[in-house]
């Protein structure tokens, strides 16, 4: 019990436009719907596909969609099947075609006074209505002795005469639309007294000093006149020739011969035929002087064995177009084989090492010959001459790792350190032969190095481990002058490294032993409580078996570190008054005082008349101005240490006393009053 709610219906359709055949089904069970075209299942395509149960056409095609469509619904469980009514398209279309000669059989047979029939090959459905045109003007039935049938597609001219000559085209229309002829027909029916071309001159290319011949013939009844002209419209005859055409000869049959052609002879030659009636017939031909330019240079080429490569030879500009061929070792290449020429290309299929060498591209025409060489190298995979080897390099000295290879072309060598590409800098240098030089070897240069040698054919690589032989050195070297604070605990470190762990000891420079309150603990000199007598010169000695010993001299100074006795205070001063910023420091050696005002050091030699720094370190500023406001820093320093302290200076306007304020009332700020 499959029921169709909608059946497809036959309908008009337009070629190339959308269409839809509807089908809607109801059934007790699940059904699948498919379509038949003339009894065969319809396969979905982008153009024609099922949409739900309906069949959709994106673009109707008069060839593929002609026939009877049927919608089929099938219940796969019960096997029940129902088929819709048949539906088909009445497809409307129109298709352009050429205008062709139907009668006589060929153009050569068209003679004056014969019947000529043209056929318009525009087809369509419904059958189109035709309209004929001569030189773009519509023709109507019975017009000027021609019979036109618009029902049929034929145009009959009876009889055909010169007045019928022209370009014939046709258009047709039907319910689909309009189309015009894709190719038109030129009908030429000559008047016997008109000059007609028998032989037309052709363009000629000649080499300098060669000869050129132009042929030209016309026929007419009575016979026509023939005349030759050169570019400047100067007539060429055997009696009167222009100066630059002294070597021109016009023959009785109309041919023009030019001997010993020069560049000034190049140009357009016109052959003019004039009949008793009708317009003159002008034929043109050009005389070109042969020429050939130079060929561009080839870059040398590097190819790999086994590959297929092509080298294109760009022919030089020339007239006529130069012919191109390739040669190798003086022998022209064949057009097939393993190494051959194809068009302008040199083809090397499955390259062998023996293919290396110079190949020459030749180009030639009437003007001469040109050639250009290309050097072809067949790359080989590098081979080892000397691989890098595990090496022991001395710290601080230059070290070398070798990577010597050979190949064609010369290989390029790159080095990697810990898988990182080494870029040449002040410490690394790669020589032309591939050797790596490490300038001033450092401890951390001890790692893996890999060199890669490459050509276009392939690469080889090898790696080596570098072990750095450390020199005996202090790490870090002790400071040559150091201060210790009097009556405090102090330490002076000394450490060193070498190939073997060095032993470290301290001694006084004069050789005397260290006092009992000074200990040497694994290279660290320890003063439990610094005395004045601890000042002096000390030597740190680092030594090991293989490398001997090294010494570092240290001068120790005992100092009382700086403290401030008086520090500057936050100060507010009336404009025009004097500001005093006090600063006093003590220490041993006796500290020097410097002042910094508004982020610059105040140089005592360049202070000017308003500022002065006293021996005790205090800073006085006379006649203060608002721009003197800011932070002032007192810096106390000696050879052992440096300390600083700072305070702000504010410069304010003196207030005008108000009536409400009693005499002697205090100012609103903590002031320095001078």
């Amino acid at each position: 019990a499959i029921v169709f709610i909608k059946q497809p219906s036959s309908q008009d359709a337009l070629q190339g436009r959308r269409a839809l055949l509807r089908c809607e089904v109801e059934a007790p069970g699940l059904v699948h719907v498919y379509w038949l075209l003339d009894g065969a299942p319809v396969q979905d395509t982008e153009r024609r596909f099922t949409q739900g149960s309906s069949l959709s056409f994106a673009a109707v095609d008069r060839l593929q969609d002609s026939g009877t469509f049927q919608c089929v619904a099938r219940d796969d469980v019960t096997g029940e099947e129902a088929r819709s009514a048949n539906a088909s398209f009445n497809i409307k279309w129109i298709e352009a075609g050429p205008v062709v000669l139907k009668h006589p059989a060929s153009e050569a047979e068209i003679q004056p006074q014969t019947q000529v029939t043209l056929r318009c090959h525009i087809d369509g459905h419904p059958r189109p209505t035709y309209q004929w045109f001569r030189d773009g003007t519509p023709l109507s039935d019975g017009q000027s002795n021609n019979t036109v049938s618009s029902k049929e597609r034929n145009l009959t001219l009876r009889p055909a005469g010169p007045e019928h000559s022209g370009l014939y085209s046709c258009c047709a229309h039907n319910a689909f639309g309009q189309a015009c002829s894709s190719q038109n027909f030129t009908l030429s029916i000559a008047d016997e007294s008109f000059a007609r071309v028998v032989l037309a001159p052709q363009d000629v290319i000649v080499a300098r000093n060669e000869e050129a011949m132009f042929h030209c013939q016309f026929s007419a009844q009575p016979p026509p006149n023939l005349q030759w002209l050169f570019e400047d419209e100067t007539p060429i005859t055997n009696r009167s020739r222009p100066p630059h055409l002294r070597r021109a000869t016009v023959f009785a049959n109309g041919s023009l011969l030019l001997t010993q052609v020069r560049p000034r002879n190049a140009g357009v030659y016109r052959c003019i035929g004039q009949g008793q009636r009708g317009p003159p017939v002008i034929l043109e031909a050009t005389l070109h002087l042969a020429e050939i330019e130079d060929m561009p240079l080839f870059e040398p080429r590097v190819f790999t064995a086994g590959s297929e490569e092509r080298v294109t030879c760009l022919p030089p500009k020339g007239l006529p177009e130069p012919s191109v061929w390739w040669e190798h070792a003086g022998v022209r290449l064949p057009t097939h084989g393993r190494v051959y020429q194809k068009g302008h290309e040199l083809v090397l299929a499955s390259i062998a090492e023996s293919d290396a060498g110079v190949y020459t591209c030749h180009a030639a025409n009437l003007a001469g010959q040109r050639r250009q060489d290309v050097n072809i190298t067949v790359a080989t995979v590098p081979t080892w001459l000397k691989k890098p080897q595990d090496s022991q390099l001395e710290e601080g000295k230059p070290g070398y790792l070798h990577c010597l290879t050979q190949a064609t072309p010369k290989p390029t060598v790159v080095w990697y350190r810990n898988q990182m590409l080494i870029s040449e800098d002040s410490r690394f240098e790669v020589f032309k032969n591939g050797t790596l030089r490490i300038n001033n070897v450092e401890v951390y240069d001890g790692t893996w190095y890999r060199c890669v040698s490459s050509t276009p054919a392939g690469s080889i690589e090898a790696q080596a481990r570098v072990q750095v032989l450390e020199k005996l050195k202090f790490t870090p070297p002790p400071q040559p002058q150091q201060c210790m604070e009097f009556d405090k605990e102090a330490t002076v470190p000394c450490s060193a490294t070498g190939r073997e762990k060095p032993t470290i000891k301290w001694e006084r420079a004069d050789g005397s032993s260290l006092p009992e309150w000074v200990t040497d603990n694994a290279g660290t000199l320890h003063f439990a409580r610094v005395t004045r007598d601890d000042a002096g010169n000390y030597t740190c000695i680092a030594s090991n078996g293989p490398q001997g010993q090294i010494r570092a001299h240290v001068q120790l100074t005992v100092a009382v570190f700086i403290t401030f006795k008086v520090e500057p205070e936050r100060t507010t001063v009336y404009q025009g008054h004097t500001a005093l910023l006090q600063c006093e420091a003590q220490g041993d050696p006796k500290p020097l005082i410097q002042w910094k005002g508004k982020d610059r050091i105040l140089d005592p030699t360049k202070l000017g008349p308003r500022m002065h720094i006293f021996q005790n370190g205090s800073l006085v500023i006379h006649d203060v101005a608002p721009e003197d406001s800011g932070r002032y820093t007192c810096i106390a320093g000696n050879s052992c240490n440096i300390k600083h302290t700072e305070a702000p200076l504010y410069v304010v306007d003196k207030p005008v006393p108000e009536e409400s304020e009693g005499p002697g009332s205090p100012p609103p700020y903590k002031m320095i009053q001078t």
Partner: antibody, heavy 122, light 107 residues
């Protein structure tokens, strides 16, 4: 003989509910879509909605005027279609017909019930 | 929704006259159009399906034509039993819609 018999009509207040039944016999009910059509007194025919067959997953479609208030269902084992009407309005007053149509083979069929009157009034 | 415009809404003709009713769809409905006859107090009865096909048992005096948007229903010779209201109905697209009806009476 094909028969469609509607029942369940009557008087109901606005906002009330009513369920109409349509009992089918004499044709393969399970393979047909069922439609409901109504006709107010002295007025034209108005399509109410449709329920499709199992082949089309019992899909339902409704007229805009009843969407959200009316529900069509069916029971193929009882050869019966239903129209559940909720939130009834006075303008729902009409004779309600159930109907079925389509091609069986190449013959078109168009079956209508005798109709049942629904009056919505306070 | 597809609007169906039926004309005339009523017409009076003599027995034996040829009667024509037209129906216009607001968009192309192909040939998915039915014509119904409804007599007072009765359910509608199908006369023409798919625009031009006569239903089984319907006299040949009824006919339909048209495709796309314009459709015509014709009674070739009016008889007294033809007094009724006639409706066109499209089922190309849901919702199914009816014309407003044409009431036919005899002069």
């Amino acid at each position: 003989e094909v028969q469609l018999v509607e029942s369940g009509g009557g008087l109901v207040q606005p906002g009330g509910s009513l369920k109409l039944s349509c009992a089918a016999s004499g044709f393969t009910f399970s393979g047909c879509a069922m439609h409901w059509v109504r006709q107010a007194s002295g007025k034209g025919l108005e399509w109410v909605g449709r329920i499709r067959s199992k082949a089309n997953n019992y899909a339902t479609t409704y007229a805009a005027s009843v969407k959200g208030r009316f529900t069509i269902s069916r029971d193929d084992s009882k050869n019966t279609a239903y129209l559940q009407m909720n939130s009834l309005k006075t303008e729902d007053t009409a004779v309600y017909y159930c109907t079925s149509r389509g091609y069986s083979g190449f013959d078109w069929f168009d079956y209508w019930g005798q109709g049942t009157l629904v009056s919505v009034s306070s | 929704d597809i609007q169906m415009t039926q004309s005339p809404s009523s017409l009076s003709a003599s027995v034996g006259d040829r009667v024509t009713i037209t129906c216009r769809a607001s968009q192309d409905i192909s040939n998915y159009l039915n014509w119904y006859q409804q007599k007072p107090g009765k359910a509608p009865k199908l006369l023409i399906y798919d625009a031009s096909n006569l239903d089984k048992g319907v006299p040949s005096g009824f006919s339909g034509s048209g495709s796309g948007t314009d459709f015509t229903f014709t009674i070739s010779s009016l008889q007294p039993e033809h007094i009724a209201t006639y409706y066109c109905q499209q089922y190309d697209n849901l919702p199914i819609t009816f014309g407003q009806g044409t009431r036919l009476e005899i002069k």
